[in-house]
Amino acid sequence: AIELVPEHQTVPVSIGVPATLRCSMKGEAIGNYYINWYRKTQGNTMTFIYREKDIYGPGFKDNFQGDIDIAKNLAVLKILAPSERDEGSYYCACDT
């Protein structure tokens, strides 16, 4: 069965210092899937951030960078210059 596992449950981030979120795929080969990232904020709203290849939700393209690491079978989301408004729970998902 396919499973996407976050590398860390909690990621402490400093304002302005680039941060990387990683999701490991188990049981399947990541290159065969489109990876999506979402953010859930306090109001329980799920906001779309990124989908392969190079598709970003409104307002996310300048500060977020999505990618996959074929070698490590990982999905990666970089926050280039984190600020307080980037706080929340981030979710990775996949589809074909």
């Epitope: 049981g27 399947e28 080969a29 290159g31 065969n32 899937y33 079978n73 074909t96």
Partner: antibody, heavy 125, light 110 residues
Framework: QVQLQESGPGLVKPSETLSLTCTVS????????WNWIRQPAGKGLEWVGR???????NYNPSLKSRVTMSIDTSKNQFSLNLSSVTAADTAVYFC???????????????????WGQGTMVTVSS | SSELTQPASVSGSPGQSITISCTGT?????????VSWYQQHPGKAPKLMIY???KRPSGISNRFSGSKSGNTASLTISGLQAEDEADYYC??????????FGGGTKLTVL
């Protein structure tokens, strides 16, 4: 046991396009990456390229301008087109399944665990 | 995409151990723990012997082992047997867009 079988013309004229198909039998085409690798007579192996089941591709940089790969998951087949061939493209062409899963479900790319028997392609007029 | 460097030939007597080296660069062998080794008998397709540097696929004898140090990977065959005589190729993942093979090593069992 999954098996791979290459098919296509054994003789191609210079400047024409070499076209090969690999059929995956006794197993699914999902869960792995699919590759073409060639071997000129008496020489070493050369990676041509890979295709993912969603259709994305990676090609050997030295062949990139001439290579196109495609996949048809409904038929359990993937294909190679190599354009503008010359005598230097004469080789045995293998299709191969890439990737190995360990007991924990971790996937390791870069390992070609199942190969076709190879098909000889000669470029000559 | 230059190939990895292997010795053209190695030889050993039955029962002995031999090691085949595979030297790459920091862009391939040195950057990824994804070196694989293949055995190829004349007229046959290659067979995977080692993956991810040192892991053995099921069904492969524990006489075959792999290791890596820096930009060089190695395949060791212990207790050499006549059926081990073949060509051996190393291969390294070199980023999502490339895979490189070694030039091959002919193993002769004396």
């Amino acid at each position: 046991q999954v098996q791979l079988q290459e098919s296509g013309p054994g003789l191609v004229k210079p400047s024409e396009t070499l076209s090969l198909t690999c059929t995956v039998s006794s197993g699914s085409i999902s869960s792995y990456y699919w590759n073409w690798i060639r071997q000129p007579a008496g020489k070493g192996l050369e990676w041509v390229g890979r295709i993912y089941t969603i259709g994305n591709t990676n090609y050997n940089p030295s062949l990139k301008s001439r290579v196109t790969m495609s996949i048809d998951t409904s038929k359990n087949q993937f294909s190679l087109n190599l354009s503008s061939v010359t005598a230097a493209d004469t080789a045995v062409y293998f299709c191969a399944r890439e990737g190995y899963y360990d007991s924990s479900g971790s996937f390791f790319p870069g390992a070609f665990g199942i190969w076709g028997q190879g098909t000889m392609v000669t470029v000559s007029s | 995409s230059s190939e990895l460097t292997q010795p053209a030939s190695v030889s050993g007597s039955p029962g002995q151990s031999i090691t085949i080296s595979c030297t790459g660069t920091s862009n391939d062998v040195g950057s990824y723990n994804l070196v694989s080794w293949y055995q190829q008998h004349p007229g046959k397709a290659p067979k995977l012997m080692i993956y991810a540097g040192s892991k053995r696929p099921s069904g492969i004898s524990n006489r075959f082992s792999g290791s890596k140090s820096g930009n060089t990977a190695s395949l060791t065959i212990s207790g050499l047997q006549a059926e081990d005589e073949a060509d051996y190729y190393c291969c390294s993942f070199a980023g999502a867009t490339n895979v490189v093979f070694g030039g091959g090593t002919k193993l002769t069992v004396l």
